[in-house]
């Protein structure tokens, strides 16, 4: 009997109520592999989800996110709100990056400005909420008498050392 079921192709299921005949998957369901005893319910792309690929008898629907949101997780299991550059998502929604951090994308979290001094360099262009600092040559690399390209360091939040 098991052999009969294994002959049922994708898009069908092995119908125990009908002497293990291979029956087509009902509407809004699918089976992506052969030998299935049931068909899976198609995913519905509702709310913040939109359909990227319709469900067929052999494959599940694929969802995307509506405008203003982006996919998170395997197979776009969640839609996360977009933020503007210079912001990150928190429980309360989009918040500006804290001083010393930046985000140059519409998603993800704010991250610290690069620590130029780690590479023995100095800050050539100050960082902003949207952009990382630009590191330049170290003060020692500048010829004697040349003015340093490093702008004055901005005041820091207490307890933070972004540079």
């Amino acid at each position: 009997l098991q052999d009969l079921c294994s002959n049922c192709p994708a898009g069908t299921f092995c119908d125990n109520n009908r002497s293990q005949i291979c029956s087509p998957c009902p509407p809004n369901s699918f089976s992506s592999a052969g030998g299935q005893r049931t068909c899976d319910i198609c995913r519905q792309c509702k709310g913040v989800f939109k359909t990227r690929k319709e469900c067929s008898s052999t494959s599940n629907a694929e969802c995307d996110c509506i405008s203003g949101y982006h996919c998170l997780g395997a197979e776009c299991s969640m839609c996360e709100q977009d933020c503007k550059q210079g912001q990150e998502l928190t429980k309360k929604g989009c918040k500006d990056c804290c001083f010393g951090t930046f985000n140059d994308q519409k998603r993800g979290i704010c991250r610290p400005w690069t620590n130029c001094s780690l590479d023995g360099k100095s800050v050539l262009v100050n960082g902003t909420k949207e952009r990382d600092v630009v590191c330049g040559p170290s003060p020692a690399d500048l010829s004697p008498g040349a003015s340093s390209a490093t702008p004055p360091a901005p005041a820091r939040e207490p307890g933070h050392s972004p540079q």
């Epitope: 951090t101 979290i109 991250r111 620590n115 307890g159 050392s161 972004p162």
Partner: antibody, heavy 121, light 112 residues
């Protein structure tokens, strides 16, 4: 599988320094904050600071500014915390922890096993 | 300074329900997510509740989290207490998105 594996226990003299390592595996090391948290015997959790390994950017708790230094070696996916001018009150278990990139106020989803640092003369 | 205050200890009998509170002293408890960690002696903290009320895979549904804006506090509730639940529990939130804040911890004793 994501893992954070820390270096072994240390016994240090007052006034000296200690460097604790935290080797990450199972994820892209440069794309997640590593936080450093400590716990004195019988006490609660205390934030020391954090590093973004992607560019070496750091933040320090006010209490630890000037004494703690965080670095990251991206070639070995290892974060380091060095604490200088040690005193007996620094005796604690030191943890590294990873924060997901979902939101700016997210939880710590993976923790190292902890490193006991004992400061004693 | 932002502080999260937890009771030092709570105790209850097996099978009962216990609630651990986490009160924010200033600001709005709804501004940032609250997370809860369990720590057994000699072990690292593990997440029991994240983002106010979500349970990681593998955490029993006996554990639940909630936020009460009227008391400016978060709560961790454990129902059907088991002896294995005996541990320290810590709440965690933020002062700013780069400054995490922890509660002082609550020692849960399951009465034998």
């Amino acid at each position: 599988e994501v893992q954070l594996v820390q270096s072994g226990a240390e016994v240090k003299k007052p006034g000296s320094s200690v460097k604790v390592s935290c080797k990450a595996s199972g994820y892209t090391f440069t794309s997640y904050y590593i936080y450093w948290v400590r716990q004195a015997p019988g006490q609660g959790l205390e934030w020391i600071g954090n590093i973004w390994p992607g560019n070496g950017g750091t933040f320090y708790g006010e209490k630890f500014m000037g004494r703690a230094t965080f670095t990251a070696d991206t070639s070995t996916s290892t974060a380091y915390m060095e604490l200088s001018s040690l005193r007996s009150e620094d005796t604690a278990v030191y943890y590294c922890a990873r924060r997901p990139d979902y939101s700016g106020d997210d939880y710590f989803d993976y923790w190292g096993q902890g490193t006991l640092v004992t400061v004693s003369s | 300074n932002v502080m999260l205050t937890q009771p030092h200890s709570v105790s209850e009998s097996p099978g009962k329900t216990v609630t651990i509170s986490c009160k924010l002293n200033s600001g709005n408890i709804g501004s940032y997510y609250v997370h809860w960690y369990q720590q057994r002696p000699g072990s690292s903290p593990t997440t029991m509740i994240y983002r106010d009320d979500k349970r990681p895979d593998g955490v029993p549904d006996r554990f639940s989290g909630s936020i009460d804006s009227s008391s400016n506090s978060a709560s961790l509730t454990i129902s059907g207490l088991k002896t294995e639940d005996e541990a320290d529990y810590y709440c965690h939130s933020y002062d700013s998105t780069i400054t995490p804040v922890f509660g002082g911890g609550t020692k849960l004793t399951v009465l034998g």
